[in-house]
């Protein structure tokens, strides 16, 4: 069974998938569509790297541009380094500027909804 066939079979169960499953799925050439991606748990999407999301979406990665202001895409963008986002060539904006350090302060993030940044 190829990645696309596998994805069709599990598609309806993905809404509650944890990060680990999404990371594993990104290695399967599944080409997840944006409708499915947008239904994923935000907390499961946030830890994914740019490379993992690119692999997960395959040719659909271009669709991130059209959804960049909607959750969970918006929240994921805020967690990525802008340099990494730029590698996609989609013009995605709002990533962490080059040279900034991300502090994983869960309380601060829970209150503000955004990661805590320290400048260069």
């Amino acid at each position: 069974m190829n990645g696309s066939e596998y994805f069709v079979k599990i598609q309806s169960f993905l809404g509650g998938a944890p990060t680990e499953d999404l990371k594993a799925l990104s290695q399967q050439n599944v080409s997840m569509d944006l409708a499915t991606f947008m239904k994923l748990r935000t907390d499961a999407v946030l830890p994914l790297t740019v490379a993992e999301v690119q692999k997960l979406l395959g040719p659909h990665v271009e669709g991130l541009k059209a959804e960049e202001r909607h959750r969970p895409v918006r929240d994921w963008i805020l967690r990525q380094r802008q340099d990494d986002l730029d590698t996609l060539g989609l013009g995605l904006q709002g990533g962490i500027p080059n040279g900034y350090l991300v502090l994983d302060l869960s309380m601060q993030e829970a209150l503000s909804g955004t990661p805590c940044l320290l400048g260069p």
């Epitope: 569509d33 947008m38 669709g63």
Partner: antibody, heavy 119, light 106 residues
Framework: EVQLQQSGPELVKPGTSVKILCKAS????????MDWVKQRHGQSLEWIGD????????IYNQKFEGKAILTVDKSSSTAYMELRSLTSEDTAVYYC????????????WGQGTTLTVSS | QIVLTQSPAIMSASPGEKVTMTCSVN?????IYWYQQKPGSSPRLLIH???NLASGVPVRFSGSGSGTSYSLTISRMEAEDAATYYC?????????FGGGTKLEIK
């Protein structure tokens, strides 16, 4: 066949609010964002904002922040746009338009709802 | 915000004639979309992703361009093509439409 059926024309007084509906049929409601577009008589099209039916996430053209409020009812595949504090500037035809998630264009449009604001 | 300038604003063409209208953008965009609107009707998608014909659109319509310059061409004008045509971009927020080109039949 995909259809977006909008509510009928409205004649309302300045300062009031109105809620326009757009009922979708013929396809999976949650695979598409619902966008709203304004067109004043003889003029071009103005994008108001859109809503994602899966998450209720909304984005608005800054010009319409506070003017328009977008909501959806997934159970009836219906999108709503409420327009507040109406003035004569809000007199226009309002369209709902379907946008597939991840795409930048509107492949199906409602027939339009004419809103007239007059005392 | 990105501004789309369509030209000409109004034009007329005879049946069978080739028609070209343009959409100029003040900043580079990835794609342009084209819509047709007839009086009293809703807009209808003609072309997506700059050059792809939407479902049911006659092959006499075509789109091209890149960066800041785009065009819509009708290879042979027909009476039913009389309408106003709008370009639209989704590359930068907020999403905007051009002012339209009104195409009349001679």
């Amino acid at each position: 066949e995909v259809q977006l059926q909008q509510s009928g024309p409205e004649l309302v007084k300045p300062g009031t609010s109105v809620k326009i509906l757009c009922k979708a049929s013929g396809d999976t409601f949650t695979a598409y964002n619902m966008d709203w577009v304004k067109q004043r008589h003889g003029q071009s099209l103005e994008w108001i904002g859109d809503i994602n039916p899966n998450t209720d996430s909304t984005i608005y053209n800054q010009k319409f922040e506070g003017k328009a409020i977008l909501t959806v009812d997934k159970s009836s595949s219906t999108a709503y746009m409420e327009l507040r504090s109406l003035t004569s500037e809000d007199t226009a035809v309002y369209y709902c338009a379907r946008r597939k998630l991840g795409r930048g264009y509107f492949d199906y449009w409602g027939q339009g709802t004419t809103l007239t604001v007059s005392s | 915000q990105i501004v789309l300038t369509q030209s000409p604003a109004i034009m007329s063409a005879s049946p069978g004639e080739k028609v070209t209208m343009t959409c100029s953008v003040n900043l580079s965009v990835r794609y342009i979309y084209w819509y047709q609107q007839k009086p009293g009707s809703s807009p209808r998608l003609l072309i997506h992703d700059t050059s792809n014909l939407a479902s049911g659109v006659p092959v006499r319509f075509s789109g091209s361009g890149s960066g800041t310059s785009y065009s819509l061409t009708i290879s042979r004008m027909e009476a039913e093509d009389a309408a106003t045509y709008y370009c639209q971009q989704w590359s930068s927020f907020p999403y905007t439409f051009g002012g339209g080109t009104k195409l009349e039949i001679k």
